[in-house]
């Protein structure tokens, strides 16, 4: 069987060779070939070439689409600004205002309190919280800011925490906490910031912000 296949391949190769040689002879205007024969062979050859070129274009398009699909790694970044809230909740509220960033719909600010991502990956997540407190007016407990994560089907968890003791300055002393780290997030995961006393948070321009970017 293998021998017969080999003979078949050689025959095809020979036919191709003869065909190419005939085209060459047509081109050089060899008189032994009739004009009709040459025209027929030429149009046949042009058809082949056209098919090859069309196939090449299609492949190129497919490849470029594959590349685009592979390169579909858009920048995902968000930076939101603190918003004073009448709510007594310890979760800080944020807004898309001032010099904010929301790169695309692969990250969203939900209910004004959490940044939710649609793509799995490593993210740098950060928060800066500025607060004004006084030792006498505050409880003994320090001011604590927590960066928290809620993944679908999982419990909430604390990713990062920072604590500052209250100032002795009057009426209150301003202090800033910065939290930041790299974490693996699943699709649908939400991150948010919690503080022990939201009433002490400073909402002046640039004081308190929250964001993330996909690495």
């Amino acid at each position: 069987h293998r021998r017969l296949d080999k003979i078949e391949d050689e025959r095809n190769l020979h036919e191709d060779f003869v065909f190419m040689k005939t085209i060459q002879r047509c081109n050089t205007g060899e008189r032994s070939l009739s004009l009709l024969n040459c025209e027929e062979i030429k149009s046949q050859f042009e058809g082949f070439v056209k098919d090859i070129m069309l196939n090449k274009e299609e492949t190129k398009k497919e490849n470029s689409f594959e590349m685009q699909k592979g390169d579909q790694n858009p920048q995902i970044a968000a930076h939101v600004i603190s918003e004073a809230s009448s709510k007594t909740t310890s979760v800080l509220q944020w807004a898309e205002k001032g010099y904010y960033t929301m790169s695309n719909n692969l990250v969203t600010l939900e209910n004004g309190k959490q940044l939710t991502v649609k793509r799995q990956g490593l993210y740098y997540i950060y928060a800066q919280v500025t607060f004004c407190s006084n030792r006498e007016a505050s409880s003994q407990a320090p001011f604590i800011a927590s960066l928290c994560l809620k993944s679908p089907g999982r419990f909430e968890r604390i990713l990062l925490r920072a604590a500052n003791t209250h100032s002795s300055a009057k009426p209150c002393g301003q202090q800033s906490i910065h939290l930041g780290g790299v974490f693996e997030l699943q699709p649908g995961a939400s991150v948010f910031v919690n503080v022990t006393d939201p009433s002490q948070v400073s909402h002046g321009t640039g004081f308190t912000s929250f964001g993330l970017l996909k690495l």
Partner: nanobody, 120 residues
Framework: EVQLVESGGGLVQPGGSLRLSCAAS????????MGWFRQAPGKEREFVAD???????EYADSVKGRFTISADNSKNTAYLQMNSLKPEDTAVYYC??????????????WGQGTLVTVSS
């Protein structure tokens, strides 16, 4: 020694209320989430409610709107207020803690449990 002690269980009629308490000792509650679980006769232990150190709460669908979890860190105590009780709430209720940095059911300390019976 790290310990959790539940109290407040008992017999109650359908539609009635109970408040369970869980007294914690030997650790700082603000590093942990406190949770309530329950186990009905012949069934597996199931999640009821959970509270984070900063007060955020989570509930099983079956108890949402009827049960409320809370904590008093100054007293190192977690509570479970149970309203509109149903016969299917009958179970041994356990208090448990989980490290606040862990996001799955890894409760490393458990109480001995308190029995709640809902029956007329």
């Amino acid at each position: 020694e790290v310990q959790l002690v539940e109290s407040g269980g008992g017999l109650v009629q359908p539609g009635g209320s109970l408040r369970l308490s869980c007294a914690a000792s030997g650790f700082t509650p603000d590093d942990y989430a406190m949770g309530w679980f329950r186990q009905a006769p012949g069934k597996e232990r199931e999640f009821v409610a959970d509270i984070m150190p900063y007060g955020s709460t989570e509930y099983a669908d079956s108890v949402k709107g009827r049960f409320t979890i809370s904590a008093d860190n100054s007293k190192n105590t977690a509570y479970l207020q149970m309203n509109s009780l149903k016969p299917e709430d009958t179970a041994v209720y356990y208090c448990a803690r989980r490290d606040a940095g862990i996001d799955f059911y890894y409760m490393d300390v458990w109480g001995q449990g308190t029995l709640v019976t809902v029956s007329s």
